[in-house]
Protein backbone atom coordinates (compact mmCIF):
# COMPACT_ATOMS: atom_id res chain seq x y z
CA UNK A 1 0.00 0.00 0.00
CA UNK A 2 1.22 3.04 -1.06
CA UNK A 3 1.11 5.22 2.15
CA UNK A 4 2.97 2.56 4.04
CA UNK A 5 6.27 3.37 1.76
CA UNK A 6 8.78 5.20 3.20
CA UNK A 7 10.12 8.24 1.57
CA UNK A 8 13.51 6.86 -0.76
CA UNK A 9 16.52 8.31 1.21
CA UNK A 10 17.37 11.78 -0.76
CA UNK A 11 13.81 11.91 -2.27
CA UNK A 12 12.52 14.40 0.44
CA UNK A 13 11.77 17.23 -1.57
CA UNK A 14 12.71 20.96 0.34
CA UNK A 15 10.32 23.15 -2.00
CA UNK A 16 7.89 22.45 -4.72
CA UNK A 17 9.81 22.26 -7.95
CA UNK A 18 10.12 20.53 -11.94
CA UNK A 19 11.88 17.47 -10.41
CA UNK A 20 8.37 16.44 -8.37
CA UNK A 21 7.50 15.53 -12.23
CA UNK A 22 9.64 12.85 -12.13
CA UNK A 23 8.68 11.10 -8.77
CA UNK A 24 6.45 8.14 -9.21
CA UNK A 25 3.39 8.21 -7.58
CA UNK A 26 3.62 6.27 -4.39
CA UNK A 27 6.86 7.93 -4.42
CA UNK A 28 4.83 11.52 -4.56
CA UNK A 29 2.19 9.86 -1.58
CA UNK A 30 5.68 8.71 0.36
CA UNK A 31 7.36 12.06 0.15
CA UNK A 32 5.32 15.42 -0.12
CA UNK A 33 4.19 16.90 2.38
CA UNK A 34 1.06 19.14 2.29
CA UNK A 35 2.08 22.07 4.17
CA UNK A 36 4.74 22.67 1.55
CA UNK A 37 2.45 22.29 -1.33
CA UNK A 38 0.07 24.54 0.61
CA UNK A 39 2.99 27.05 1.15
CA UNK A 40 3.84 26.88 -2.62
CA UNK A 41 0.77 26.81 -4.85
CA UNK A 42 1.71 29.20 -7.58
CA UNK A 43 4.33 26.85 -8.26
CA UNK A 44 2.36 23.50 -7.97
CA UNK A 45 -0.28 25.38 -10.77
CA UNK A 46 3.12 26.45 -12.54
CA UNK A 47 4.94 23.04 -13.09
CA UNK A 48 3.29 20.77 -15.77
CA UNK A 49 2.04 18.01 -13.59
CA UNK A 50 -0.12 15.62 -14.64
CA UNK A 51 -3.66 15.26 -13.66
CA UNK A 52 -2.53 11.73 -11.34
CA UNK A 53 0.09 13.78 -9.68
CA UNK A 54 -2.41 16.88 -8.75
CA UNK A 55 -4.74 13.98 -7.36
CA UNK A 56 -2.19 12.92 -4.78
CA UNK A 57 -1.29 16.65 -4.39
CA UNK A 58 -4.79 17.39 -3.23
CA UNK A 59 -4.92 14.05 -1.20
CA UNK A 60 -1.94 15.69 0.47
CA UNK A 61 -3.66 19.28 1.56
CA UNK A 62 -6.58 17.19 2.20
CA UNK A 63 -4.81 14.74 5.18
CA UNK A 64 -3.40 17.97 6.31
CA UNK A 65 -6.47 20.35 6.83
CA UNK A 66 -9.15 17.62 7.33
CA UNK A 67 -11.43 20.46 8.65
CA UNK A 68 -11.05 22.15 5.69
CA UNK A 69 -8.28 24.99 3.65
CA UNK A 70 -7.80 27.51 5.74
CA UNK A 71 -8.44 30.80 3.64
CA UNK A 72 -4.48 31.60 3.40
CA UNK A 73 -4.44 28.85 0.89
CA UNK A 74 -7.81 29.36 -0.96
CA UNK A 75 -6.56 32.53 -1.81
CA UNK A 76 -3.60 31.04 -3.41
CA UNK A 77 -5.09 27.76 -4.73
CA UNK A 78 -5.33 29.82 -8.35
CA UNK A 79 -6.22 26.89 -11.23
CA UNK A 80 -5.62 24.00 -8.45
CA UNK A 81 -9.42 25.30 -7.71
CA UNK A 82 -10.54 22.84 -10.44
CA UNK A 83 -9.44 19.80 -8.92
CA UNK A 84 -11.84 20.78 -5.99
CA UNK A 85 -14.82 19.17 -5.35
CA UNK A 86 -18.48 21.21 -4.11
CA UNK A 87 -18.20 19.03 -1.12
CA UNK A 88 -14.65 20.06 -0.15
CA UNK A 89 -15.62 23.48 -0.65
CA UNK A 90 -18.51 23.38 1.73
CA UNK A 91 -16.33 22.95 4.69
CA UNK A 92 -14.44 26.41 3.93
CA UNK A 93 -14.80 29.41 5.33
CA UNK A 94 -14.22 32.33 3.08
CA UNK A 95 -15.00 35.85 3.91
CA UNK A 96 -12.98 37.55 1.12
CA UNK A 97 -14.92 39.01 -1.60
CA UNK A 98 -11.67 39.00 -3.63
CA UNK A 99 -11.03 35.40 -3.09
CA UNK A 100 -14.50 34.87 -4.56
CA UNK A 101 -14.11 36.60 -7.48
CA UNK A 102 -10.52 35.22 -8.38
CA UNK A 103 -11.61 31.79 -7.72
CA UNK A 104 -14.76 32.15 -10.16
CA UNK A 105 -12.98 33.71 -13.15
CA UNK A 106 -10.56 30.42 -12.37
CA UNK A 107 -13.42 28.19 -13.03
CA UNK A 108 -15.48 30.18 -15.96
CA UNK A 109 -16.17 28.28 -19.04
CA UNK A 110 -14.66 24.52 -17.12
CA UNK A 111 -17.96 22.66 -16.81
CA UNK A 112 -18.01 23.83 -12.28
CA UNK A 113 -21.13 25.07 -12.24
CA UNK A 114 -21.56 23.68 -8.95
CA UNK A 115 -18.15 24.69 -7.59
CA UNK A 116 -18.70 28.42 -8.15
CA UNK A 117 -22.26 27.55 -6.79
CA UNK A 118 -20.36 25.79 -3.36
CA UNK A 119 -18.24 28.93 -2.97
CA UNK A 120 -20.49 31.73 -2.94
CA UNK A 121 -23.07 29.92 -0.67
CA UNK A 122 -20.19 29.04 1.65
CA UNK A 123 -19.06 33.11 1.38
CA UNK A 124 -22.52 34.31 2.00
CA UNK A 125 -22.73 31.59 5.45
CA UNK A 126 -19.50 33.38 6.65
CA UNK A 127 -21.79 36.88 6.41
CA UNK A 128 -20.11 38.06 3.11
CA UNK A 129 -23.09 39.77 0.84
CA UNK A 130 -23.43 38.83 -3.01
CA UNK A 131 -23.32 41.88 -5.05
CA UNK A 132 -23.82 42.69 -8.65
CA UNK A 133 -20.06 42.54 -9.40
CA UNK A 134 -20.19 38.58 -8.08
CA UNK A 135 -23.44 37.59 -10.16
CA UNK A 136 -21.44 38.97 -13.21
CA UNK A 137 -18.08 37.08 -12.49
CA UNK A 138 -20.32 34.12 -11.85
CA UNK A 139 -21.14 34.62 -15.64
CA UNK A 140 -23.70 32.30 -17.70
CA UNK A 141 -24.12 30.35 -14.51
CA UNK A 142 -28.37 30.28 -14.84
CA UNK A 143 -29.19 31.84 -11.49
CA UNK A 144 -31.11 28.92 -10.42
CA UNK A 145 -28.32 28.40 -7.84
CA UNK A 146 -29.95 30.85 -5.72
CA UNK A 147 -31.99 27.77 -5.05
CA UNK A 148 -29.13 25.66 -3.87
CA UNK A 149 -28.52 28.55 -1.18
CA UNK A 150 -29.98 27.95 2.35
CA UNK A 151 -32.75 30.58 3.48
CA UNK A 152 -30.28 31.64 5.82
CA UNK A 153 -27.77 32.94 2.99
CA UNK A 154 -30.57 34.25 0.60
CA UNK A 155 -31.41 36.84 3.32
CA UNK A 156 -27.76 37.85 2.48
CA UNK A 157 -28.44 38.26 -1.59
CA UNK A 158 -29.10 42.28 -2.09
CA UNK A 159 -32.56 42.82 -4.20
CA UNK A 160 -30.89 44.22 -6.97
CA UNK A 161 -29.79 40.67 -7.71
CA UNK A 162 -33.62 39.96 -8.38
CA UNK A 163 -33.26 41.97 -12.18
CA UNK A 164 -30.79 39.52 -13.54
CA UNK A 165 -33.21 36.29 -12.67
CA UNK A 166 -35.14 35.11 -15.27
CA UNK A 167 -38.16 32.48 -16.01
CA UNK A 168 -36.38 29.12 -16.25
CA UNK A 169 -33.96 30.19 -12.91
CA UNK A 170 -36.34 29.66 -10.36
CA UNK A 171 -38.18 26.31 -11.71
CA UNK A 172 -36.10 23.93 -8.96
CA UNK A 173 -36.37 26.79 -5.82
CA UNK A 174 -38.27 25.04 -2.72
CA UNK A 175 -41.72 27.02 -1.74
CA UNK A 176 -39.57 28.60 1.42
CA UNK A 177 -36.95 30.19 -1.45
CA UNK A 178 -39.61 31.44 -3.81
CA UNK A 179 -41.63 32.98 -0.86
CA UNK A 180 -38.39 34.87 -0.25
CA UNK A 181 -37.62 35.64 -3.25
CA UNK A 182 -40.61 37.06 -4.05
CA UNK A 183 -40.32 39.48 -0.89
CA UNK A 184 -37.01 41.03 -2.47
CA UNK A 185 -38.50 41.03 -6.32
CA UNK A 186 -40.75 42.88 -4.67
CA UNK A 187 -39.01 45.59 -2.71
CA UNK A 188 -36.14 45.47 -6.13
CA UNK A 189 -38.96 46.29 -8.29
CA UNK A 190 -41.05 48.66 -5.94
CA UNK A 191 -40.48 52.05 -8.16
CA UNK A 192 -41.44 50.05 -11.36
CA UNK A 193 -44.85 50.95 -12.62
CA UNK A 194 -48.15 49.27 -14.61
CA UNK A 195 -47.04 46.62 -16.97
CA UNK A 196 -43.34 46.82 -16.67
CA UNK A 197 -43.91 45.83 -12.74
CA UNK A 198 -45.79 42.81 -13.73
CA UNK A 199 -43.34 41.67 -16.45
CA UNK A 200 -40.41 41.65 -13.86
CA UNK A 201 -42.61 40.19 -11.12
CA UNK A 202 -44.20 37.69 -12.61
CA UNK A 203 -40.96 35.18 -12.95
CA UNK A 204 -41.70 35.17 -8.72
CA UNK A 205 -44.59 34.91 -8.80
CA UNK A 206 -44.91 30.98 -7.47
CA UNK A 207 -43.70 32.83 -3.85
CA UNK A 208 -47.15 35.04 -3.84
CA UNK A 209 -49.41 35.02 -0.98
CA UNK A 210 -53.11 34.45 -2.00
CA UNK A 211 -53.87 37.91 -1.12
CA UNK A 212 -50.72 39.46 -2.95
CA UNK A 213 -52.64 37.77 -5.83
CA UNK A 214 -55.57 39.54 -5.31
CA UNK A 215 -54.08 42.96 -5.32
CA UNK A 216 -52.14 42.12 -8.61
CA UNK A 217 -56.13 40.98 -10.43
CA UNK A 218 -57.18 44.87 -10.01
CA UNK A 219 -54.48 45.73 -12.55
CA UNK A 220 -55.55 43.66 -15.57
CA UNK A 221 -52.50 42.29 -16.09
CA UNK A 222 -53.91 39.30 -18.52
CA UNK A 223 -51.40 36.77 -16.62
CA UNK A 224 -50.51 34.14 -19.10
CA UNK A 225 -51.28 30.61 -18.44
CA UNK A 226 -47.60 29.47 -18.11
CA UNK A 227 -47.33 31.59 -14.76
CA UNK A 228 -50.69 30.67 -13.76
CA UNK A 229 -49.49 27.20 -13.47
CA UNK A 230 -46.17 28.61 -11.78
CA UNK A 231 -48.66 30.34 -8.55
CA UNK A 232 -48.43 28.14 -5.72
CA UNK A 233 -51.57 25.62 -5.46
CA UNK A 234 -52.22 26.89 -1.79
CA UNK A 235 -52.55 31.07 -2.85
CA UNK A 236 -54.40 29.60 -5.91
CA UNK A 237 -56.90 27.78 -4.25
CA UNK A 238 -58.44 30.58 -2.26
CA UNK A 239 -58.88 32.94 -5.20
CA UNK A 240 -62.57 33.17 -6.72
CA UNK A 241 -63.20 32.84 -10.41
CA UNK A 242 -64.42 35.70 -10.82
CA UNK A 243 -60.85 37.20 -9.26
CA UNK A 244 -59.23 34.33 -11.10
CA UNK A 245 -60.95 35.95 -14.14
CA UNK A 246 -59.62 39.23 -13.41
CA UNK A 247 -56.01 37.85 -13.37
CA UNK A 248 -56.24 35.82 -16.92
CA UNK A 249 -58.15 38.75 -18.55
CA UNK A 250 -58.33 36.99 -22.62
CA UNK A 251 -55.98 34.10 -21.33
CA UNK A 252 -59.17 32.48 -19.27
CA UNK A 253 -59.81 30.28 -22.32
CA UNK A 254 -56.33 28.61 -21.91
CA UNK A 255 -58.02 27.15 -18.41
CA UNK A 256 -59.90 24.15 -20.37
CA UNK A 257 -56.59 22.97 -21.73
CA UNK A 258 -55.05 22.75 -18.34
CA UNK A 259 -58.11 21.73 -16.47
CA UNK A 260 -56.98 17.90 -15.47
CA UNK A 261 -53.19 18.96 -14.37
CA UNK A 262 -52.32 20.63 -11.37
CA UNK A 263 -52.24 23.62 -9.81
CA UNK A 264 -55.80 24.31 -12.31
CA UNK A 265 -57.41 20.85 -11.37
CA UNK A 266 -56.72 21.90 -7.63
CA UNK A 267 -58.29 25.58 -8.10
CA UNK A 268 -61.27 23.95 -9.99
CA UNK A 269 -62.12 21.44 -6.77
CA UNK A 270 -62.59 24.30 -4.81
CA UNK A 271 -64.56 26.55 -6.92
CA UNK A 272 -68.50 26.18 -7.12
CA UNK A 273 -69.24 24.24 -10.29
CA UNK A 274 -71.91 27.17 -11.07
CA UNK A 275 -69.53 29.82 -11.06
CA UNK A 276 -67.35 27.81 -13.35
CA UNK A 277 -70.25 27.13 -15.75
CA UNK A 278 -70.78 30.86 -15.43
CA UNK A 279 -67.18 31.19 -17.91
CA UNK A 280 -68.99 29.43 -20.72
CA UNK A 281 -65.85 26.93 -21.40
CA UNK A 282 -66.82 23.72 -20.09
CA UNK A 283 -64.47 23.89 -17.46
CA UNK A 284 -65.37 20.53 -14.95
CA UNK A 285 -64.96 19.03 -11.63
CA UNK A 286 -66.24 22.25 -9.56
CA UNK A 287 -68.45 21.89 -6.24
CA UNK A 288 -71.54 20.55 -7.19
CA UNK A 289 -74.56 22.28 -6.47
CA UNK A 290 -76.28 21.70 -2.97
CA UNK A 291 -72.44 20.71 -1.91
CA UNK A 292 -70.83 22.59 0.80
CA UNK A 293 -66.83 22.11 0.95
CA UNK A 294 -66.30 22.05 5.29
CA UNK A 295 -62.67 20.77 4.69
CA UNK A 296 -60.29 21.21 2.06
CA UNK A 297 -59.77 17.53 1.29
CA UNK A 298 -63.11 16.27 2.11
CA UNK A 299 -66.21 17.08 0.14
CA UNK A 300 -69.57 16.38 2.39
CA UNK A 301 -73.37 16.09 1.15
CA UNK A 302 -75.23 19.07 1.94
CA UNK A 303 -78.66 17.96 3.63
CA UNK B 1 26.35 29.81 -27.64
CA UNK B 2 24.01 27.27 -26.64
CA UNK B 3 24.66 24.08 -29.11
CA UNK B 4 23.36 20.28 -29.05
CA UNK B 5 25.07 18.04 -31.73
CA UNK B 6 23.82 14.65 -32.27
CA UNK B 7 25.82 11.57 -33.41
CA UNK B 8 25.76 10.50 -36.48
CA UNK B 9 22.97 8.36 -38.73
CA UNK B 10 22.08 4.55 -37.61
CA UNK B 11 20.94 1.47 -39.81
CA UNK B 12 19.77 -1.05 -37.68
CA UNK B 13 18.02 -4.89 -38.17
CA UNK B 14 14.74 -5.13 -36.91
CA UNK B 15 15.05 -6.45 -32.93
CA UNK B 16 18.24 -4.58 -32.43
CA UNK B 17 18.98 -1.48 -30.11
CA UNK B 18 20.13 1.79 -30.77
CA UNK B 19 21.58 4.33 -28.38
CA UNK B 20 21.81 8.27 -29.96
CA UNK B 21 24.45 10.99 -27.90
CA UNK B 22 23.66 14.48 -27.90
CA UNK B 23 26.39 16.25 -26.48
CA UNK B 24 25.64 19.84 -25.02
CA UNK B 25 27.82 22.99 -25.18
CA UNK B 26 27.41 26.92 -24.11
CA UNK B 27 25.56 26.45 -21.49
CA UNK B 28 25.66 24.59 -17.89
CA UNK B 29 24.62 20.98 -18.83
CA UNK B 30 22.93 20.37 -15.74
CA UNK B 31 21.06 23.50 -15.56
CA UNK B 32 18.23 22.24 -18.06
CA UNK B 33 16.37 19.31 -18.35
CA UNK B 34 16.62 17.37 -22.36
CA UNK B 35 14.12 15.66 -24.10
CA UNK B 36 13.76 13.27 -27.13
CA UNK B 37 11.42 14.00 -30.11
CA UNK B 38 11.44 11.65 -32.82
CA UNK B 39 9.93 12.51 -36.64
CA UNK B 40 8.91 9.48 -38.56
CA UNK B 41 9.94 10.04 -42.52
CA UNK B 42 6.61 12.60 -43.42
CA UNK B 43 5.24 12.26 -40.57
CA UNK B 44 5.07 15.25 -37.32
CA UNK B 45 6.79 15.11 -34.33
CA UNK B 46 6.70 12.80 -31.33
CA UNK B 47 7.39 13.27 -27.39
CA UNK B 48 9.39 10.39 -26.27
CA UNK B 49 10.43 11.12 -22.36
CA UNK B 50 12.79 13.95 -20.43
CA UNK B 51 16.03 13.26 -18.34
CA UNK B 52 16.81 15.49 -15.83
CA UNK B 53 20.60 15.51 -16.07
CA UNK B 54 21.25 16.64 -12.81
CA UNK B 55 20.01 13.25 -10.91
CA UNK B 56 19.01 11.28 -14.06
CA UNK B 57 15.49 10.56 -13.08
CA UNK B 58 13.76 9.98 -16.49
CA UNK B 59 10.11 10.35 -17.20
CA UNK B 60 9.16 8.22 -20.41
CA UNK B 61 5.53 8.74 -23.13
CA UNK B 62 3.86 5.63 -22.32
CA UNK B 63 4.37 4.51 -25.74
CA UNK B 64 7.60 3.83 -25.09
CA UNK B 65 7.73 2.77 -21.62
CA UNK B 66 9.94 -0.77 -21.38
CA UNK B 67 11.53 0.03 -24.51
CA UNK B 68 13.61 3.64 -24.68
CA UNK B 69 16.30 4.46 -21.58
CA UNK B 70 17.56 7.71 -21.29
CA UNK B 71 20.72 8.11 -19.48
CA UNK B 72 23.67 11.32 -19.05
CA UNK B 73 27.37 12.00 -18.12
CA UNK B 74 27.74 14.72 -16.95
CA UNK B 75 31.30 14.52 -17.04
CA UNK B 76 31.38 14.93 -20.58
CA UNK B 77 27.61 16.85 -20.79
CA UNK B 78 25.82 14.30 -23.06
CA UNK B 79 22.53 12.89 -23.13
CA UNK B 80 21.73 9.45 -24.25
CA UNK B 81 18.55 7.45 -26.19
CA UNK B 82 18.63 4.16 -26.19
CA UNK B 83 15.53 2.42 -28.13
CA UNK B 84 15.44 -1.72 -28.00
CA UNK B 85 13.48 -4.18 -29.88
CA UNK B 86 13.35 -1.97 -32.80
CA UNK B 87 10.87 -2.55 -35.57
CA UNK B 88 10.66 -0.53 -39.10
CA UNK B 89 7.71 1.64 -37.64
CA UNK B 90 10.92 3.40 -35.19
CA UNK B 91 12.43 4.10 -38.33
CA UNK B 92 12.72 7.95 -38.10
CA UNK B 93 14.43 11.34 -37.22
CA UNK B 94 15.80 11.38 -33.28
CA UNK B 95 16.02 15.04 -31.70
CA UNK B 96 17.19 15.97 -28.73
CA UNK B 97 15.91 19.21 -27.26
CA UNK B 98 16.59 21.42 -24.58
CA UNK B 99 13.98 22.35 -21.69
CA UNK B 100 13.85 25.56 -20.63
CA UNK B 101 12.72 25.54 -17.07
CA UNK B 102 9.65 27.55 -16.20
CA UNK B 103 8.51 27.92 -19.53
CA UNK B 104 8.32 24.12 -20.22
CA UNK B 105 9.46 25.30 -24.20
CA UNK B 106 12.30 23.49 -26.35
CA UNK B 107 14.21 26.54 -26.76
CA UNK B 108 17.37 24.55 -28.69
CA UNK B 109 17.42 21.25 -30.54
CA UNK B 110 20.08 19.26 -31.90
CA UNK B 111 20.48 18.73 -35.81
CA UNK B 112 18.57 15.38 -35.37
CA UNK B 113 20.30 11.42 -35.73
CA UNK B 114 18.62 9.12 -38.84
CA UNK B 115 17.80 5.94 -37.61
CA UNK B 116 16.99 3.28 -40.26
CA UNK B 117 15.25 0.12 -39.23
CA UNK B 118 15.55 -2.35 -42.22
CA UNK B 119 16.19 -5.54 -42.76
CA UNK C 1 -2.18 9.79 -31.10
CA UNK C 2 -2.45 13.26 -31.66
CA UNK C 3 -4.34 15.20 -29.32
CA UNK C 4 -3.22 18.77 -30.78
CA UNK C 5 -5.35 19.31 -34.40
CA UNK C 6 -3.68 21.23 -36.94
CA UNK C 7 -4.69 21.80 -40.79
CA UNK C 8 -2.68 19.54 -42.70
CA UNK C 9 -1.98 22.59 -44.93
CA UNK C 10 -2.39 26.14 -45.37
CA UNK C 11 -0.97 28.43 -48.64
CA UNK C 12 -0.86 32.08 -49.35
CA UNK C 13 0.63 34.39 -51.74
CA UNK C 14 3.38 36.81 -50.82
CA UNK C 15 2.58 39.82 -48.73
CA UNK C 16 -0.66 38.09 -47.21
CA UNK C 17 -1.36 36.85 -43.94
CA UNK C 18 -2.69 33.69 -43.00
CA UNK C 19 -3.02 31.92 -39.79
CA UNK C 20 -2.84 27.89 -39.01
CA UNK C 21 -5.25 26.51 -36.25
CA UNK C 22 -4.37 24.67 -33.23
CA UNK C 23 -7.09 22.96 -31.39
CA UNK C 24 -7.25 21.39 -28.05
CA UNK C 25 -9.04 20.38 -25.16
CA UNK C 26 -9.42 20.95 -21.21
CA UNK C 27 -6.33 19.04 -20.50
CA UNK C 28 -3.71 20.61 -22.47
CA UNK C 29 -4.53 24.36 -24.13
CA UNK C 30 -7.12 24.77 -22.05
CA UNK C 31 -5.18 25.28 -18.63
CA UNK C 32 -1.56 25.32 -20.09
CA UNK C 33 0.65 27.44 -22.39
CA UNK C 34 1.27 26.50 -26.12
CA UNK C 35 4.43 27.21 -28.08
CA UNK C 36 5.13 26.54 -31.80
CA UNK C 37 7.86 26.01 -33.81
CA UNK C 38 8.92 25.85 -37.36
CA UNK C 39 10.64 23.29 -39.68
CA UNK C 40 12.24 24.29 -42.46
CA UNK C 41 12.69 21.61 -45.10
CA UNK C 42 15.77 19.05 -44.08
CA UNK C 43 16.35 21.22 -40.60
CA UNK C 44 15.93 20.80 -37.14
CA UNK C 45 12.62 22.35 -35.38
CA UNK C 46 13.04 26.18 -34.22
CA UNK C 47 11.11 28.05 -31.54
CA UNK C 48 9.07 30.52 -33.08
CA UNK C 49 6.28 31.26 -30.09
CA UNK C 50 6.07 30.56 -26.75
CA UNK C 51 4.03 31.43 -23.84
CA UNK C 52 1.03 31.56 -26.18
CA UNK C 53 2.38 34.59 -28.03
CA UNK C 54 5.79 35.36 -27.14
CA UNK C 55 8.71 36.12 -29.44
CA UNK C 56 11.59 34.77 -28.36
CA UNK C 57 14.84 37.12 -30.03
CA UNK C 58 15.64 37.03 -33.54
CA UNK C 59 11.80 36.08 -34.65
CA UNK C 60 10.52 38.61 -37.01
CA UNK C 61 7.24 40.41 -35.39
CA UNK C 62 5.51 39.06 -38.70
CA UNK C 63 4.97 36.13 -36.52
CA UNK C 64 2.45 36.59 -33.28
CA UNK C 65 0.49 33.98 -31.35
CA UNK C 66 -3.08 33.86 -29.51
CA UNK C 67 -5.11 31.47 -27.29
CA UNK C 68 -8.97 32.15 -26.59
CA UNK C 69 -10.17 28.45 -24.42
CA UNK C 70 -9.05 25.21 -25.99
CA UNK C 71 -7.33 26.71 -29.27
CA UNK C 72 -4.49 28.56 -30.29
CA UNK C 73 -3.38 30.14 -33.34
CA UNK C 74 -0.27 31.25 -35.19
CA UNK C 75 -0.62 34.32 -37.58
CA UNK C 76 1.59 35.61 -40.10
CA UNK C 77 1.34 38.59 -42.09
CA UNK C 78 3.20 40.14 -45.20
CA UNK C 79 4.29 36.29 -46.26
CA UNK C 80 7.42 35.61 -47.45
CA UNK C 81 8.85 32.65 -49.63
CA UNK C 82 11.40 32.06 -46.74
CA UNK C 83 8.53 30.85 -44.47
CA UNK C 84 7.16 27.91 -46.53
CA UNK C 85 8.20 24.98 -43.99
CA UNK C 86 5.84 23.22 -41.34
CA UNK C 87 4.41 24.64 -38.27
CA UNK C 88 3.55 22.86 -35.07
CA UNK C 89 2.07 23.96 -31.86
CA UNK C 90 2.85 22.08 -28.89
CA UNK C 91 1.88 22.19 -25.36
CA UNK C 92 1.95 19.98 -21.83
CA UNK C 93 -0.69 17.86 -21.59
CA UNK C 94 -2.36 16.78 -18.18
CA UNK C 95 -2.89 13.67 -18.85
CA UNK C 96 0.21 12.55 -21.22
CA UNK C 97 2.79 14.86 -20.08
CA UNK C 98 4.19 16.60 -23.80
CA UNK C 99 2.07 17.02 -26.93
CA UNK C 100 2.47 17.97 -30.43
CA UNK C 101 -0.04 19.04 -32.67
CA UNK C 102 0.34 16.89 -36.19
CA UNK C 103 1.69 19.89 -38.04
CA UNK C 104 0.94 21.65 -41.02
CA UNK C 105 2.42 22.56 -44.33
CA UNK C 106 2.55 26.28 -45.39
CA UNK C 107 3.02 26.59 -49.06
CA UNK C 108 3.92 30.46 -50.71
CA UNK C 109 2.01 30.63 -53.98
CA UNK C 110 3.94 31.84 -57.09
Known amino acids: DAEQKACPPGKEPYKVDEDLIFYQNWELEACVDGTMLARQMDLVNEIPFTYEQLSIFKHKLDKTYPQGYPESLIQQLGHFFRYVSPEDIHQWNVTSPDTVKTLLKVSKGQKMNAQAIALVACYLRGGGQLDEDMVKALGDIPLSYLCDFSPQDLHSVPSSVMWLVGPQDLDKCSQRHLGLLYQKACSAFQNVSGLEYFEKIKTFLGGASVKDLRALSQHNVSMDIATFKRLQVDSLVGLSVAEVQKLLGPNIVDLKTEEDKSPVRDWLFRQHQKDLDRLGLGLQGGIPNGYLVLDFNVREAFS | QVQLVQSGAEVKKPGASVKVSCKASGYTFTGNYINWVRQAPGQGLEWMGIINPTKGWTLYAQKFQGRVTMTRDTSISTAYMELSSLRSEDTAVYYC????????????WGQGTLVTVSS | DIVLTQPPSVSGAPGQRVTISCSGS????????VSWYQQLPGTAPKLLIY???QRPSGVPDRFSGSKSGTSASLAITGLQSEDEADYYC??????????FGGGTKLTVLG
Open chain 2, 97 to 108: ARWHHGTWIFDY
Open chain 3, 51 to 53: NDN
Open chain 3, 26 to 33: SSNIGSNY
Open chain 3, 90 to 99: STYDRRTFSV
